[in-house]
């Protein structure tokens, strides 16, 4: 806190320019009519205040804001941003994307602050859901952005905006966000032909369902390793010996390199030995010959 | 407290350029502030040209359109290019980042400052 002070004789701030650098933080406090500096915000970024000096300018922005700076000023706070705390931003209105991204622009390069996190989730409540252009431009500021929300808050994404999300944005994603996504994905997609639309559906297939996999396997897509690792175990294991071979094509040889890990192993535990066979390399583990295969989750089922 | 090691100054004829450098014992990065002094004669520094990392800039009056302070953060340096120089130009340079405000009395970080001289 600043004491209050008298401002000094011939020091009265007229505008917001370069003089006022050289101000004690107690001048600054004193000489400011804090209105003039919510008119003038857009001139403060051009100005080397110390981070000192930034500290009393918000003090005299939350006096005259108490509750919560209106978007004109907001969308000029720069670096004086950082000085704001997840406490103040929760009393802001951002409805603008122009704000968000200037604000985004002052903590680029950096982590997601807790700043940034309570400014984000402000703004898409207040836009009441995650559209395209919102999507686009937090996952170019932050492309793990998407794998940050929880399942429930990725149910309120639009297929629309599925057509923003990168492979590297899905990067962190683990399974139940990808169940979440995948059918938007496929809806969004769903005009495309055979090789683009499996370019676009790739990065989402580690949440797609068995009967998705097989149809897959009809349109000779050529799966890379990489992306039969990240499919789900459940809909791995119903898959035929000759739907993999399909579904992976040239990649097939892949799987020998694979066959201790999930769901590579618990695949190959599930087919006859004499299909695995066919394949050609070396893949052990398989049900031996003569054996009969009783799926007892069927079983259950029935009864 | 950055501690700063200035260099780049020497003897130049008016007209001529200079480009000063100033590497402070921290990660430049995450200096917030940073700037150039100089003193000619007398016992004040005066501001020559201030950067801060939100992108604000200040050059004194004499100075503006000639000086450009700048930063490289892979080089872990501060840089203030003079050109066109001039006699009145002749001072020891220092760089410093500020305390409370820029005035030459709140700064505590002094280096050993690098003279320029440029001749007529």
């Known amino acids: 806190e600043v004491e209050k002070t008298a401002c000094p004789s011939g020091k009265k701030a007229r505008e917001i320019d370069e003089s006022l650098i050289f101000y004690k933080k107690w001048e600054l406090e004193a000489c400011v009519d804090a209105a003039l500096l919510a008119t003038q915000m857009d001139r403060v970024n051009a100005i080397p205040f110390t981070y000192e000096q930034l500290d009393v300018l918000k003090h005299k922005l939350d006096e005259l804001y108490p509750q919560g700076y209106p978007e004109s000023v907001i969308q000029h706070l720069g670096y004086l941003f950082l000085k704001m705390s997840p406490e103040d931003i929760r009393k802001w209105n951002v409805t603008s994307l122009e704000t968000l991204k200037a604000l985004l622009e002052v903590n680029k390069g950096h982590e997601m602050s807790p700043q940034v996190a309570t400014l984000i989730d402000r703004f898409v409540k207040g836009r009441g859901q995650l559209d395209k252009d919102t999507l686009d431009t937090l996952t170019a500021f932050y492309p793990g952005y998407l794998c940050s929300l929880s399942p429930e808050e990725l149910s309120s994404v639009p297929p629309s905006s599925i057509w923003a999300v990168r492979p590297q944005d899905l990067d962190t994603c683990d399974p139940r966000q990808l169940d979440v996504l995948y059918p938007k994905a496929r809806l969004a997609f769903q005009n495309m032909n055979g090789s683009e639309y499996f370019v676009k559906i790739q990065s989402f297939l580690g949440g797609a369902p068995t009967e998705d996999l097989k149809a897959l396997s009809q349109q000779n897509v050529s799966m890379d390793l990489a992306t039969f690792m990240k499919l789900r175990t459940d809909a791995v294991l119903p898959l035929t010996v000759a739907e993999v071979q399909k579904l992976l094509g040239p990649h097939v040889e892949g799987l020998k390199a694979e066959e201790r890990h999930r769901p590579v192993r618990d695949w190959i535990l599930r087919q006859r030995q004499d299909d695995l066979d066919t394949l050609g390399l070396g893949l052990q583990g398989g049900i031996p010959n003569g054996y009969l295969v009783l799926d007892l989750s069927m079983q259950e089922a029935l009864s | 407290e950055v501690q700063v090691v200035e260099s780049g100054g020497g003897l130049v004829q008016a007209g001529g350029s200079l480009r000063l450098s100033c590497v402070p014992s921290g990660s430049i990065s995450s200096i917030y502030a940073m700037g150039w002094y100089r003193q000619a004669l007398g016992p004040e520094r005066e501001l020559v040209a201030a950067?801060?990392?939100?992108?604000?800039?200040y050059y004194a009056n004499p100075v503006k359109g000639r000086f450009t302070i700048y930063r490289d953060n892979d080089k872990n340096t501060l840089y203030l290019q003079m050109n066109n120089l001039k006699p009145e130009d002749t001072a020891m340079y220092y760089c410093?980042?500020?305390?409370?405000?820029?005035?030459?009395?709140?700064?505590?970080?002094w280096g050993q400052g690098t003279q320029v001289t440029v001749s007529s």
């Open positions: 410093a980042t500020p305390g409370e405000h820029w005035g030459s009395s709140d700064v505590t970080n």
């Open positions: 950067q801060t990392l939100g992108g604000g800039t």
